[in-house]
């Protein structure tokens, strides 16, 4: 058991350029407070998993109020550390949610107003009972600046909080196999005691009074040997005679929820959905109001002004529970058609779409010409794994919008000046060249290069490129 | 607060372009697709097309495809519309909307009415 | 294209009553994947911007009032208001989303 201890100190403009507004005036003074939520492991910041390790909610700061013209200088912080109690081991590695509120202290109708102004995640590791960690981050134009630490409580110590310490027996020295507990030189590490019974070659403990099993051996102490080649099912007959896999207390046996949560069981422990008014790993956390900000990830609080009134969270995009603790799973509805990828982005969902698709969904056919008119009279062409636009003259690029400048390419050859034309181009030839793009020289005698002269043109005229 | 702020409204003449424009905030421009949609008295809504943020790519209704083009400007977080050769028909409310891959038109613009008039 | 049709095109009901409202899609809206279907409502206050209702055809979006309930699918959707109120003045569109965009011509209703 332990303390994980967060100390804020400061929450204000970061630098560089776009300053934020400040987030209180004078006609709505406001007060800032934080709350952390911390989760075992470097699971995403957004994982399922509600804030399994805990969390914790900061004093209100004091009221503030923008002095006008001046820039949003820090703004002014609750007193004392959030304290996040963990009663098992602690991880070693963690993720961390910091999230900075305003209570705005206007004349708002039915109590203050509750806005998240920054969010900031991250996923450390940390050995418990080290020196504080210095940390800035930053959310936007905002920035954060804070420490943290986990500590043990006695007469838990190491870096986990899983050895306990008790007063030494002797004056000079600890038992055999025992250490001195540093940093509390007068006291003695204190043997691991597992279960009573625990079998001291097929079992194991990490905590006191537990009895883990190694790998072949089962059974409340680990003295049944596991053979699931007579087993009638995976949790079959529970006979240690049979020796077979005999499935240990369940992780929702007795209902460890709390004050009327339902327990469901996940792939490592268990997890409480819990009835409104109550929140925390087994619904413990009674008595909440608006003001205690049960409202995870964004959600708004609305009601719940005395601990007796129902409060209710309207949750943002993605995220759902009576304390929008969960995060709702969006990509299984498997949105994305023509074998797009989903991405939850948290705030929205995306698709990634294969090449040749598009649209929120994939449902666009790129390649299909029935699906994506040229503009201006352009025709699709379709082949290649994509569409084409083969455009009416004047007019380019890939749908045909752009207008195009028939002379850009400078089609017209030895030194003709080029005109753009309503139905094309025009090539104006230099003298001695003729043809649509003044290719082919006039010779000497008045003969051309050309089988024949098309009737009525002389060498020079301007030729109209059709 | 996720927001879609139009421009104002347009009077123009017939055979004009009028280009409207889309202000996204609130949230991340490039991770939605903006659409825009067509409204005439009694004619309901009819979509004209949409825009993806991320990489420009756009498609239309057909029947919009020489009337109209979209264009989206991510520095700034704004979508346009540019209509061209107006008409009568031309005359409507023009509004923006936001999607993506879970939610339909979630987010609306409060509008842009357009009259076209000599 | 698909095509979208609303019927009734307008209902006049008094307050407290049920509301049933209908639209067809010239074609399947039924994606076989994952067998949802890409059909939105939306409602239109006077003077207002449309406001999504419902999505995937019958997902109540997040602050819908519960007597708004979407229902149907392939072809033939519903939308319906178990107990009309002065503020459901409003005319109402369905959207298919499945191919394109296209929109229903409304439903309006009014209030006696």
């Known amino acids: 058991a332990g303390v994980f201890e967060l100390q804020i100190h400061s929450f204000g403009p970061g630098p560089g350029p776009g300053a934020p507004r400040s987030p209180c005036s004078a006609r709505l003074p406001c007060r800032l407070f934080f709350r952390v939520c911390l989760k075992p492991g470097l699971s995403e910041e957004a994982a399922e998993s509600p804030c399994a390790l805990g969390a914790a909610l900061s004093a209100r700061g004091p009221v503030y109020t923008e002095q006008p013209g001046a820039p949003a200088p820090d703004l002014p912080l609750p007193d004392g550390l959030l304290q996040v109690p963990f009663r098992d081991a602690w991880p070693g590695t963690f993720s961390f949610i910091i999230e900075t509120w305003r209570e705005e202290l206007g004349d708002q109708i039915g109590g203050p107003a509750w806005s998240l102004l920054a969010r900031v995640a991250g996923r450390r590791r940390l050995a418990a009972g080290g020196p504080w960690a210095r940390d800035i981050q930053r959310a936007g134009a905002w920035e954060l600046r804070f420490s943290y630490r986990a500590r043990c409580e006695p007469p838990a110590v190491g870096t986990a909080c899983t050895r306990l310490c008790r007063p030494r027996s002797a004056p000079s020295r600890c038992g055999p196999g025992l250490r001195p507990c540093a940093p509390l030189e007068d006291e003695c590490e204190a043997p691991l005691v597992c279960r009573a019974g625990c079998s001291p070659e097929h079992g194991f403990c990490e905590q006191p009074g537990e009895c883990r099993c190694l790998e072949g051996w089962t059974g409340p102490l680990c003295t049944v040997p596991v053979s699931t080649s007579s087993c009638l099912s995976p949790r079959g007959p529970s006979s240690a005679t049979t020796g077979c896999l005999v499935p240990g207390p369940g992780p929702c046996d007795g209902n460890p929820c709390a004050n009327g949560g339902s327990c469901s069981e996940t792939p490592r422990s268990f997890e409480c959905t819990c009835p409104r008014g109550f929140y925390g790993l087994r619904c413990e956390v009674s008595g909440v109001t608006c003001a205690d900000g049960p409202c995870f990830n964004g959600g708004l609080c609305v009601g719940g002004a005395d601990p007796d009134s129902a409060y209710i969270c309207h949750c943002p995009p993605g995220f759902q529970g009576s304390n929008c603790e969960k995060r709702v799973d969006r990509c299984s509805l498997q949105p994305c058609r023509n074998g797009g990828l989903c991405l939850d982005l948290g705030h929205a969902l995306r698709c990634r779409c294969r090449a040749g698709f598009a649209g929120p969904r994939c449902e666009h056919d790129l390649d299909d010409c029935a699906g994506r008119a040229c503009a201006n009279g352009g025709t699709c062409v379709e082949g290649g794994g994509a569409h084409r636009c083969s455009c009416a003259l004047g007019f380019g690029g890939r749908d045909c919008r752009e207008r195009a400048d028939p002379c850009a390419a400078r089609p017209c050859a030895h030194g003709g000046r080029c005109y753009a034309h309503f139905s094309g181009l025009v090539c104006a030839c230099a003298p001695g060249y003729m043809g649509a793009r003044c290719e082919f020289p006039v010779h000497p005698d008045g003969a051309s290069a050309l089988p024949a002269a098309p009737p009525g043109l002389r060498p020079g005229d301007p030729q109209r490129y059709l | 607060e996720v927001q879609l702020q139009q421009s104002g409204a347009e009077l123009v003449r017939p055979g004009a372009l009028v280009k409207l424009s889309c202000k996204a905030s609130g949230f991340n421009f490039k991770d939605y697709y903006i659409h825009w949609v067509k409204q005439r008295p009694e004619l309901g809504l009819e979509w004209i097309g949409w825009?993806?943020?991320?990489?420009?790519?756009?498609i239309y209704d057909p029947k919009f495809q020489d009337k109209a083009s979209i264009t989206a400007d991510t520095s700034s977080n704004t979508a346009y519309l540019h209509l061209s050769s107006l008409t009568s028909e031309g005359t409507a409310v023009y509004y923006c909307a936001s999607e993506d891959a879970y939610y339909p038109f979630a987010y609306w613009g409060q509008g842009t009415l357009v009259t076209v008039s000599a | 294209d698909i095509v979208m049709s609303q019927s009734p095109s307008s209902l006049a009901v008094s307050v407290g009553e049920k509301v049933t409202m209908r639209c067809k899609s010239s074609?399947?809206?039924?994606?076989?994947?994952?067998?949802?279907?890409?059909l939105a409502w939306y409602q239109q206050k006077p003077g207002q911007s449309p406001k999504l209702l419902i999505y995937?055809?019958?997902t109540r979006e997040s602050g819908v009032p519960d007597r708004f309930t979407g229902s149907g699918s392939g072809t033939d959707f519903t939308l319906t208001i178990s107990s009309v109120k002065a503020e459901d003045l409003a005319v109402y569109f369905c959207q298919q989303y499945y191919s394109y965009r296209t929109f229903g011509g409304g439903t309006k209703l009014e209030i006696k």
């Open positions: 995937w055809a019958s």
């Open positions: 825009i993806d943020p991320e990489n420009g790519n756009a």
């Open positions: 074609q399947s809206l039924l994606y076989s994947s994952n067998q949802k279907n890409y």
